[in-house]
Amino acid sequence: MMTGTIETTGNISAEKGGSIILQCHLSSTTAQVTQVNWEQQDQLLAICNADLGWHISPSFKDRVAPGPGLGLTLQSLTVNDTGEYFCIYHTYPDGTYTGRIFLEVLESSVAEHGARFQIP
């Protein structure tokens, strides 16, 4: 029986050009997390595998950084990044848990850079 629950950041907004951290948290289960997939609509952004580490999709490599933890940081946001994001937790023995986050990227005359990581 699947007893776990996914807590997400829910509906969030960020400014164009800025950064945002997407985070989900699996609780209320003793199941082992074997992999977390991050998807945007039907597009794979990243995979975090317990044995193999992180894989960032090539098309997102320059503006996505893994973490903190199992989260994902998006930077240099554009209005095209507006939409649904999904964290898909693969666990044993429970199976799959899915969380949803809706991100709205807002136009702004001054883009604030919130995240503390840099990609040269």
Partner: antibody, heavy 117, light 107 residues
Amino acid sequence: EVQLQQSGTVLARPGASVKMFCKASGYSFTSYWMHWVKQRPGQGLEWIGAFYPGNSATNYNQKFKGKAKLTAVTSASTAYMELSSLTNEDSAVYYCSREGGYGMDHWGQGASVTVSS
Amino acid sequence: DIVLTQSPATLSVTPGDSVSLSCRASQSIRNNLHWYQQKSHESPRLLIKYSSQSISGIPSRFSGSGSGTDFTLSINSVETEDFGMYFCQQSNSWPYTFGGGTKLEIN
């Protein structure tokens, strides 16, 4: 087998800089964060920062910005940390550790830095 | 930055005793807490990930619990090889931080 091999003991003068390495083997270097952790004699663990070789992303503890610089050469599966303007407070053991989202599951053996005039 | 406070600073026990070590966060970190063991003159070793998830190769006498701000590492029937330092660490947000540690010593 995953291994993180660190530089040996370093003795440096106050005001000098040192650059230490952490050579990784047994896994995909670009798929894991490389963290650096400081431990003064008889003290706890202090997180310095982390470098992600997959796209050169970095995160620093604000306390170590300007003190530590993290880099890597992916072709050699080696991470580096340079410490500048050394003082006695920088005398410590420095560990590298890898993290792929599930805790820091492998650690180097530690590199000792002694700052003395 | 998130501050992790470990207690007690030192715990004196006899082999065979069962013990609990505490780690308290200055704000909610959900379950993003990991536990490490460090023996004298050795590198730290990951014991528990995400508050309660076990690590391959770690004896089953080690277990973790907690969520939000209060976390516990339990050792069921301490063995002589368990003596040393124990640290908690959070990965909920940058910068990552460690607790000050608990020293487990022989009574």
